[in-house]
């Protein structure tokens, strides 16, 4: 059966029936629907005004535009807003209520697209292989990334947000028109990684989306990774408008000249500093979401209310951090390179500025605690990695899953731990699942592009996506049409149950409490530990006239910016030529591993760069107040409350074992999420909700952070933070 | 100017069926999407499906698949829509209207065709 | 299927009278259309996209609106206004409001 001609809220639309195997089974694939107009910079997208005639959905369309991965030029148009969709369809009548998957690509809010890198002519990001391994359709889009996504002033004149308007748009769009396609409207799911991961789940918070998503999965990353969340979008605004020669002195008149300056050059405006860097590479991403009091109405750990129907799957891959360790310290990737002490103190520190020594000496300790029993280079490399992957990735999402628990009313929670090692030639045989690595397996690339891949790679792929699609269906990763190979129990702050995924698995698969005694330390420890004024916090930026973007100071204050904890991480850029550096990480949706570079360059492979890896900031919030719950200090890795935030966050007491939203007060009940008085009513985003206001429009350095709900005034968020 | 004209009103037996034809003019055929839109006696707008003139292309609403047809002749620039197994709620005064831009907005309608389904 | 609600279903006002008729859709759309139907006339589009006037219809009719909540607005009665106000939501498989009469009082 074939769909032929489908009728959408635009026009015809006519796609092509790709035919599989000799069953007549066959896939109706439509590339290239606009599902917005032509985007204006730096405003929000608007619906597309349609066609007449039949527009033919034959190819992917460009990316957004975004820096090549050189910087040095762009790539991607203006003109991006366009879906694809995966139809699969069997022998007689065409396929009717299936379940949605629409996917949402990482790369740091900075790069990727809907269709991901080629390598041997299958696109990373193409959703054949869900689609019909899992009878499941399958929409990926593009959205707007870097400043032109993401830039803000931190108040109406520039509120932010675009690329996750743009993602709403999307999903909204397929809600009103996937009937047609042969999809349930009421069944979709939503599913990312990295960058894609903490949007998944930034989409689930947000009021905007009330009714449109009934389920999701965060791959490596969630809202309150620490380097989701922009907290001094004006620093970075003003940046960019230095650099391209708008006004900084009155944030009314900077943003018109941003919206009317070449997009290009805003886009070139921006880079990520490759070499000589002072502090973690994930300190210089600056074009993130912020809170802008409207589609993130508040800090999003206030708001898991709003996500409390939605069942939800979060996970990380056990050393996501990896390849954000090796750009910071590139000894751990060289078997001729030692770790020190001083080194891995030195990165400590980076990580840890606003809690001073002491945070820095107490983090050290803690991590170092195994090295005394093995000083092996080995041991001591993987500590490295292991603290980023904490950091920036399992210790959020930890929290993530306990207060999706917390809130939910039937909605169901999972956790998984992707293990699977990776398959980059170049890294040591230690190396676990690096970032992105999970990204093929879903998508099936071991069938698409069997060569290069093992059986045991095949196993993993097929089970992944039997999981993945099985949850789609039922909100069950175990019931659906595809056998899995163990029983996967859902995740609950008594069990903090989470599956093991890796290329032999059955009932010792189902493990607990994933290195608690790590998440107790970065939830309860650090943040009891008192946070140093910005004197004595503030790192002094690189001075010069340097291409690379100065590091902010950290605080809050007028006079210290908060540090670009921002948004990811895109790792850096490589280095081009012929030079020896060492393979550039995973970049965007660049393929994840194995796949080497497009091209035939000799490059060494670009590693796939989820997305990633921001410098953990916390979610804002109502920080010095105490007991609320995990409003704030949340736990979201080290990135200590800035500035004069007022005393640091009063950690949740009891010595209970069930982080990571440990209940707030003494009591044991759960944490009460401030939106309204009802339970589940969603944040709204407009009106008297309690919803922060925009914040007030103004020139001051640091962006206004809208108070939440239960704060007397906007002070700094109680989150870790850098 | 753009016309749409459509046939004249037909009683019709339940069980039976019905076509009703509308006749474009004033703008090229092919070039509009041609939708179906009824109304029955006292109630609100309905709309039944549309058709692209230009490669015949066509969508019906659920409530209508299988016992709707749009088809086009390309060489008299008409659309027609046949409804069959007619019961007497499809009873209804019957419109075509063509995309006034882009799509979707309505923007010119034929005079309607009334459909009177009885025994 | 998009629910669409229209208010009030009938409305009495005078010549001269600023009237408003609103339109809720579930969940959120991308644009609205707006038409009027006279008795034993077709109806004729009023408004598209939301807001935008198609040539020839008066300009004391406006719309507003985005997501789920939109407004038509005719500032200031005139006797040939009074007739039923459709709006329309634009998918895969456009709807309509149920109609709001607009009788003169």
């Known amino acids: 059966a074939k769909l032929g001609a489908v009728y959408t809220e635009g026009g015809f639309v006519e796609g092509v029936n790709k035919k599989l195997g000799l069953l007549g089974d066959s896939v109706d694939i439509f590339k290239g629907i606009p599902f917005a107009a032509p985007t204006k910079a730096l405003e929000n997208p608007q619906p597309h005004p349609g066609w007449q005639g039949t527009l033919k959905a034959k190819n992917f369309k460009k990316r957004c535009l975004q820096a090549t991965i050189t910087q040095d030029s762009t790539y991607g148009d203006e003109d991006c807003l366009y879906l694809n969709i995966w139809v699969p369809q069997g022998r007689k009548q065409v396929s009717r209520d299936l379940p949605v998957m629409i996917w949402i690509y990482g790369g740091a809010f900075l790069m990727g697209s809907g269709h991901g890198a080629n390598f041997l002519n299958n696109y990373l990001y193409d959703g054949e292989e869900i689609a019909t391994r899992g009878n499941v359709i399958v929409v990926t889009f593009n959205y707007r990334v870097g400043p032109l996504g993401f830039l803000s002033t931190g108040d109406a004149n520039l509120p932010g947000n675009y690329g996750l308007r743009d993602q709403h748009m999307a999903i909204a769009w397929v809600k009103r028109n996937i009937a047609a396609f042969g999809g349930d409207p009421n069944n979709i799911t939503l599913f990312g990684e990295s960058a894609g991961g903490a949007s998944v789940s930034l989409q689930t918070l947000s009021p905007y989306n009330k009714g449109l998503i009934r389920r999701a999965i965060s791959q490596s990353g969630v809202a309150l990774s620490p380097w989701v969340i922009q907290k001094n979008p004006l620093f970075w605004a003003k940046k960019v408008a230095e650099k391209v020669g708008c006004p900084v002195g009155d944030a009314a008149r900077m943003a018109q000249c941003l919206k009317v300056t070449d997009p290009r050059a805003l886009t070139l405006a921006y880079k990520v500093p490759l070499a000589g860097l002072e502090y973690p590479m994930l300190h210089y991403v600056g074009f993130v979401p912020v809170i802008d009091g409207d589609f993130i109405p508040a800090d999003p750990i206030n708001l898991y209310a709003n996500a409390a129907d939605i069942d939800y799957i979060a996970g990380t891959n056990n050393m996501d951090g990896h390849i954000f360790a090796s750009i910071d310290m590139p000894a751990i990737n060289k078997g001729n390179k030692k770790v020190t002490e001083e080194d891995f103190y030195k990165l400590v520190s980076e990580f840890t500025i606003t809690k001073g020594l002491r945070g820095a000496k107490t983090t050290f300790d803690v991590y170092t605690e195994s090295w005394a029993q093995d000083p092996s280079q080995e041991n001591k490399k993987k500590t490295v990695v292991d603290f980023e992957t904490d950091v920036l990735f399992l210790v959020p999402t930890e929290i993530a899953l306990a207060q999706h628990r917390a809130n939910a009313k039937s909605a169901k929670t999972y956790a998984y731990l992707f293990s699977h090692p990776s398959r980059m030639p170049v890294y040591p045989k230690w190396v676990g699942a690096d970032h992105a690595d999970d990204i093929q397996y879903v998508f099936g690339k071991p069938f698409a592009t069997p060569t290069g891949y093992r059986p045991q790679d095949r196993t993993v792929s097929k089970a992944m996506i039997a999981y993945w699609t099985n949850f789609a269906k039922t909100g069950d990763p175990n019931m659906g049409d595809s056998a899995v190979p163990t029983h996967w129990e859902p995740y609950t702050t008594e069990n903090s149950g989470y599956l093991e995924i890796t290329k032999k698995m059955g009932s010792s698969s189902m493990k607990r409490s994933l290195r608690t005694n790590f998440l107790r330390y970065w939830t309860l420890t650090y943040l009891a530990l008192p946070t140093v004024t910005d004197q004595e916090a503030t790192p002094v930026p690189p001075t010069g006239d340097s291409e690379a973007t100065p590091v902010p100071p950290t605080g809050d204050s007028e006079t210290a910016p908060v540090p670009p904890t921002g948004d990811s991480g895109a790792p850096p850029v490589p280095p081009t030529g012929d030079s020896g550096a060492p393979p550039v990480p995973p970049t965007g949706d660049s393929g994840a591993p194995p796949v080497p570079p497009t091209g035939d360059s000799g490059a060494p492979p670009v590693p796939p760069t989820g997305d990633s890896g921001a410098p953990p900031v916390p979610p804002t919030g109502d920080s010095g107040a105490p007991p609320v719950p995990p409003t704030g200090d949340s736990g979201a890795p080290p990135v200590p409350p800035t500035g004069d935030a007022g005393p640091p966050p009063v950690p949740p007491t009891g010595d209970s074992g069930a982080p990571p939203v440990p209940p707030t007060g003494d009591s044991g009940a759960p944490p009460v999420t401030p939106t309204g008085d009802s339970e589940t009513a969603p944040v709204p985003p407009t009106g008297d909700s309690g919803a922060p206001p925009v914040p007030p429009t103004g020139d001051s350095e640091a962006a206004p952070v809208p108070p939440t709900d239960d704060s007397k005034e906007a002070q700094m968020p109680a989150v870790i933070r850098f | 100017q753009v016309q749409l004209v459509q046939s004249g009103a037909e009683v019709k037996k339940p069980g039976a069926s019905v076509k009703v034809s509308c006749k474009a003019s004033?703008?090229?055929?092919?070039?509009?999407?041609m939708h179906w839109v009824r109304q029955a006696p006292g109630q609100g707008l309905e709309w039944m499906g549309v058709?692209?003139?230009?490669?015949?292309?066509?969508s019906y609403t659920q409530k209508f698949q299988g016992r709707v047809t749009m088809t086009r002749d390309t060489s008299t620039s008409t659309v027609y829509m046949e409804l069959s197994s007619l019961r007497s709620e499809d009873t209804a005064v019957y419109y075509c209207?063509?995309?006034?831009?882009?799509?979707?907005?309505?923007?010119?309608w034929g005079q309607g065709t009334l459909v009177t389904v009885s025994s | 299927d998009i629910q669409m609600t229209q208010s009030p279903s009938s409305l009495s006002a005078s010549v001269g009278d600023r009237v408003t008729i609103t339109c809720r859709a579930s969940?959120?759309?991308?644009?609205m259309n707006w038409y009027q139907q006279k008795p034993g006339k077709a109806p004729k589009l009023l408004i598209y996209?939301?807001?935008s006037l198609p040539s020839g219809v008066p300009s004391r009719f406006s719309g507003s609106g985005s997501g789920t909540d939109f407004t038509l607005t005719i500032s200031s009665l005139q006797p040939e206004d009074f007739a039923t106000y459709y709006c329309?939501?634009?998918?895969?498989?456009?709807?309509f409001g149920q109609g709001t009469k607009l009788e003169i009082k």
């Open positions: 058709i692209n003139p230009g490669d015949g292309a066509t």
């Open positions: 004033g703008y090229t055929f092919t070039s509009y999407n």
């Open positions: 209207a063509r995309d006034y831009y882009g799509s979707s907005p309505l923007g010119y």
């Open positions: 329309q939501q634009r998918s895969s498989s456009p709807t």
């Open positions: 969940p959120s759309i991308s644009y």
């Open positions: 996209a939301a807001s």
